[in-house]
Interface confidence: low
């Protein structure tokens, strides 16, 4: 509540997080021209990276171009790429949407369709959907603990989300625990009115928003969080200004003395730790 | 402008970045003792990182040190580290400048200088000036997509940078196109007063300024970001306080069962998108 | 001090960190079955990782998990983990505690105990504590320069905590140079009354805070750089909640085609810079 | 799609005033620059006001200075021309048009590059 008597000062916060949960992972591999079904168990140091406080990312899907060398080969057909003679491809012309930088020959991409040659990581890497439903789906039962200091400098207070007296095995839950700082992301995502397993597959931004109003008079002192959650991005947003969350990395090594990669388009969430709010004193 | 009987409040944000680009890199590559020149295309995942939210980092020059391996070799020979006997080594010294501990023995480096043993990854990196022009000078015409989302908690009030029909292909102009999110990197430069091409060699620290200016009562409403450029790095800073932007990282790999490491130190220009402003209510 | 006739606004800021320091670790490192002590030295490139502006990491402890690779195993036997039969094992089960999924089988771990099998990277992470005295202890001597543009938009005003009459082989000290900004770790922790190499186990959080009070009225103008220390992390913590501060990382290489990879758990102390203040004008 | 629909416009005399309104459907009116157009019989369009989202700014032609206002309500959706002193040559129909902020253009006199436009409402002002 405004107490305009008071004097009030902006929380100065500090994050740490800590994610848990494993995921299997069943997908089609292509070993020797022969396709398989692969399992493998996806834990915290597989689908996250150490990241700095107020930011955490989950990866809930992917897509791999596996064994990328630097070579020529014809760039990916995708819509309005295809050519049928040298005409059409331009000497040193790099296409914002390709992945390479044109020879100016127009070179077999597969046995009906011709493309542009590029000077790039080849073969270039494939413009498919990301899989449907999401390979690390199973992440919406991942929990993270959220650690929360912060400081009030002018009052010379300092406080923390977690109390001594609770509880490390509890979930929180809006009625039932709204005090309890470990989160099952399944439920941030219902919190938020959003459906887990369709942002899982194109990733997506989430807000947790930590709220803290404190009354630091020593008569009427309260100050403990008030934890909400929102979606960031804009799943409504036109396919021209990238809808998502995704990020392109690269795990490189050598091979016969040739540098190759693999390159992983990581799809995923990354959630915004927001924390703001007052503390107000006489 | 300030409207004194307004209820204002500081602006929460959340930013997301999406660089695109491809440079292509011609570099003398020494195999085998032989030196030729060397042509390599380098995509975003290749010369970005997967950073989080307010910043995100171009790698526009670097220096490799490659096949390091942990042993004892002599340090590099920068200005008065040469030694003549052991007497000026000190055994278990480190100096902050090298990269290694000291043996205490004053060992050759080539034919003409002699330099203390130190342990270390060996050999150790040579102290040469950043490649000028820089090795990806190209990234000038890179481009950055900036996703801002906004949220005035107490006003209960939420928006975003993009609207549903801007462009998703317009570039940023101060003039033609003030609200378009897409900037090509060599123009954040112009518009801050400040040269591409020169920064890129030692790299620096470019700030983006996303100003919230909000007015959220219903009869005059008005909510649009104004976006200003300026250079966050001192260029006229000391040698000794390390000037522009660099960090040193490792790809580490194993060869005949000896781990050995590239050691890649990365110039750039890192670009911190600092959001802030109020929102007014009466 | 309060000048209530001035017109204050937050300081909008800006962060670089430039970390210096060798460690020279000793540890017991088994090959072939023979444990001999095995000494390597740790550079920036080993210890840190490029990270965003506000924060830096040191790495002053870790466990390695070698040659993890994604198979069949038994779990770990923590407490309460081992089994006498199948039907202790619950196929398809995760445990959060666990590295894996169950197959449902209670197999032998050792000579002496069993426990349930795992789909999982194999073999699992054995939980044993954190070396003690920390591996990379000498980190207490590391420095780190810190640099700080601030900007007040409102009073169009922008400075910096580095001077250009600053030395550049200067170490911060409370009295003696309270403007210099590099700083030895191991003072920042006797600032904020911590024992750097206690924290250094298990790892923690430390606050930078670096306070501007500034008065931009030209006949009484101020602004400078006040820098304090607080441990952000609750040293207090229990268990379940995760004291200090660590994270798994892991390094992917294949042999003899297999997909292997190495498990980093990572100790070390985050340092977070808390920069905030008001600039005030009349 | 967005749609505009005007609403307020009939016959009054000259002195009197009006209160055109222009609701937006289905879009929020602080993503897009809102205009004014009217178009007499046998006339070109011409631009009558405008309010610019960037900064909430606004314009006006020279003839209607000092008489018409452009406001609106965000709560409501809608955006407002009030009309005072009207006189005869005001008789026109009155579109109300939006276009995103990022096509650089004077409203008045008259830019009909706005990307939205209404079905217009008529006024006639006659004694």
């Known amino acids: 509540s405004d107490k305009l008597y008071q004097r009030k000062e902006p929380v100065i916060s500090s994050v740490h997080t800590k994610v848990k949960g494993i995921a299997e992972v069943t997908e089609n591999v292509t070993e020797g021209g022969v396709t398989k079904l692969g399992h493998s168990i996806f834990d915290t140091a597989d689908y996250t990276f150490p990241l700095q406080g107020n930011s955490f990312f989950v990866m809930t899907n992917y897509v791999k171009s596996e064994g990328q060398v630097q070579t020529l080969c014809p760039e990916y057909p995708r819509r309005g790429a295809q050519c049928s003679s040298d005409r059409r491809c331009k000497k040193g012309w790099m296409d914002p949407q390709s992945k390479g930088i044109q020879t100016g020959r127009c070179v077999p991409y597969d046995k009906t369709r011709k493309t542009c040659e590029v000077s790039a990581w080849c073969p270039t890497e494939e413009e498919k959907e990301a899989p449907r439903p999401a390979l690390l789906r199973s992440a919406e039962n991942f929990t993270v603990l959220i650690k929360n200091n912060i400081h009030f400098p002018g009052h010379n207070y300092t406080t923390r989300n977690i109390l001594p007296t609770m509880n490390g095995s509890c979930t929180f839950h809006k009625t039932w625990d709204p005090q309890c700082s470990i989160f099952r992301l399944g439920d941030i995502f219902q919190e938020a009115g959003e459906n887990f397993t369709e942002v899982a597959v194109q990733g997506g931004i989430m807000g947790i928003e930590i709220y803290w109003d404190c009354n630091l008079d020593s008569w009427s002192h309260h100050c403990r969080p008030r934890y909400s959650f929102r979606r960031l991005d804009d799943k409504n947003m036109d396919e021209s200004f990238v809808p998502g969350y995704n990020f392109r990395y690269a795990k490189y090594y050598k091979e016969n003395n040739v540098e190759k990669r693999t390159l992983i388009k990581a799809f995923g969430i990354r959630f915004d730790i927001l924390v703001f709010g007052t503390g107000g004193k006489f | 402008s300030d409207k004194l009987y307004q209820r204002k409040e500081p602006v929460i944000s959340s930013v997301h970045t999406k660089v695109k680009g491809i440079a292509e890199v011609t570099e003398n590559v020494t195999e085998g003792g032989v030196t030729k020149l060397g042509h390599s295309i380098f995509d975003t995942a290749d010369y970005t990182f997967p950073l989080q939210g307010n910043s995100f980092f171009v790698m526009t020059n670097y220096v490799k040190s490659e096949g390091q391996v942990q042993t004892l070799c002599p340090e590099y020979p920068r200005r008065g580290a040469q030694c003549s006997s052991d007497r000026r080594c000190k055994k278990g010294w480190m100096d902050p400048q090298s990269k290694g501990i000291q043996t205490g023995r004053c060992v050759p480096y080539d034919k003409t200088r002699k330099t203390c043993e130190v342990s270390a990854w060996c050999p150790t990196e040579e102290e040469k000036e950043a490649p000028r022009p820089a090795l990806l000078r190209s990234a000038e015409n890179f481009t950055v997509l900036i996703k801002n989302n906004i949220h005035f908690p107490g006003h209960n009030y939420t928006t975003r940078n993009i609207l549903p029909t801007m462009n998703g292909s317009c570039t940023f102009h101060k003039t033609w196109d003030p609200q378009c999110s897409i900037f090509r990197l060599g123009d954040i430069f112009q518009e801050a007063g400040e040269n591409f091409t020169e920064v890129a060699v030692q790299g620096g620290i470019m700030g983006i300024e996303i100003y919230w200016d909000c007015n959220l009562d219903s009869w005059s409403h008005h909510c649009r970001p104004r976006y200003s450029f300026r250079r966050l790095d001192d260029k006229n800073m000391d040698e000794s306080f390390v000037p522009g932007y660099n960090f040193r990282y490792a790809k580490y790999y194993k060869e005949n069962n000896v781990e050995k490491r590239t050691l890649i130190k990365a110039f750039g220009i890192r670009f911190d998108i600092l959001v802030f402003g109020t929102g007014g209510k009466f | 001090s309060d000048k209530l006739y001035q017109r204050k606004e937050p300081v909008i800021s800006s962060v670089h960190t430039k970390v210096k320091g060798i460690a020279e670790v000793t540890e017991n490192v088994t090959e072939g079955g023979v444990t001999k002590l095995g000494h390597s030295i740790f550079d920036t490139a080993d210890y840190t990782f490029p990270l965003q502006g506000n924060s830096f990491f040191v790495m002053t402890n870790y466990v390695k998990s070698e040659g993890q690779v994604q198979t069949l195993c038994p779990e770990y036997p923590r407490r309460g983990a081992q089994c006498s039969s199948d039907r202790r094992c619950k196929k398809g089960w995760m445990d959060p505690q666990s590295k894996g999924i169950q197959t449902g089988r209670c197999v032998p771990y050792d000579k002496t105990r069993k426990t349930c099998e795992v789909s999982a990277w194999c073999p699992t992470e054995e939980e044993k504590e954190a070396p003690r005295p920390a591996l990379l202890r000498s980190a207490e001597n590391f420095t780190v320069l810190i640099k700080n543009n601030i900007h007040f938009p409102g009073h169009n005003y922008t400075t910096r905590n580095i001077l250009p009459t600053m030395n550049g082989s200067c170490t911060f000290h409370k009295t003696w140079d309270p403007q210099c900004s590099i700083f030895r770790l191991g003072d920042i922790f006797q600032e904020a009354g911590e024992n750097f190499t206690e924290v250094a186990v298990q790892g923690g959080i430390m606050g930078i805070e670096i306070y501007w009070d500034c008065n931009l009225d030209s006949w009484s103008h101020h602004c400078r750089p006040r820098y304090s220390f607080r441990r952000l992390d609750d040293k207090n913590m229990d268990e379940s909640f995760v004291p200090g501060y660590n994270f798994r990382y892991a390094k992917y290489y294949k042999e003899n085609n297999v997909e292997k990879r190495t498990l980093i758990k990572a100790f070390g102390i985050r340092f977070d810079i808390l920069v905030f203040g008001t600039g005030g004008k009349f | 799609e967005v749609q505009l629909v005007e609403s307020g416009g009939g016959l009054v005399q000259p002195g009197e005033s009006l209160r055109l309104s222009c609701t937006a459907s289905r879009f929020m009116l602080d993503y897009y620059d809102i205009g004014w157009f009217r178009q007499a019989p046998g006339k070109e369009r011409e631009g009558v006001s405008c309010r610019f989202t960037n900064d909430g700014s606004t314009a006006y032609a020279d003839s209607v200075k000092g008489r018409f206002t452009i406001s609106r309500d965000i709560v409501k959706h809608t955006v407002y021309l009030q009309m005072n002193s009207l006189q005869p040559e005001d008789t026109a129909v009155y579109y109300c048009?939006?276009?995103?902020?990022?096509?650089?253009?004077?409203?008045?006199?008259?830019?009909?590059?706005?990307?939205?436009w209404g079905e217009g409402t008529l006024v006639t002002v006659s004694s």
């Open positions: 048009a939006a276009g995103p902020l990022t096509k650089r253009r004077q409203c008045v006199p008259g830019d009909f590059s706005m990307d939205f």
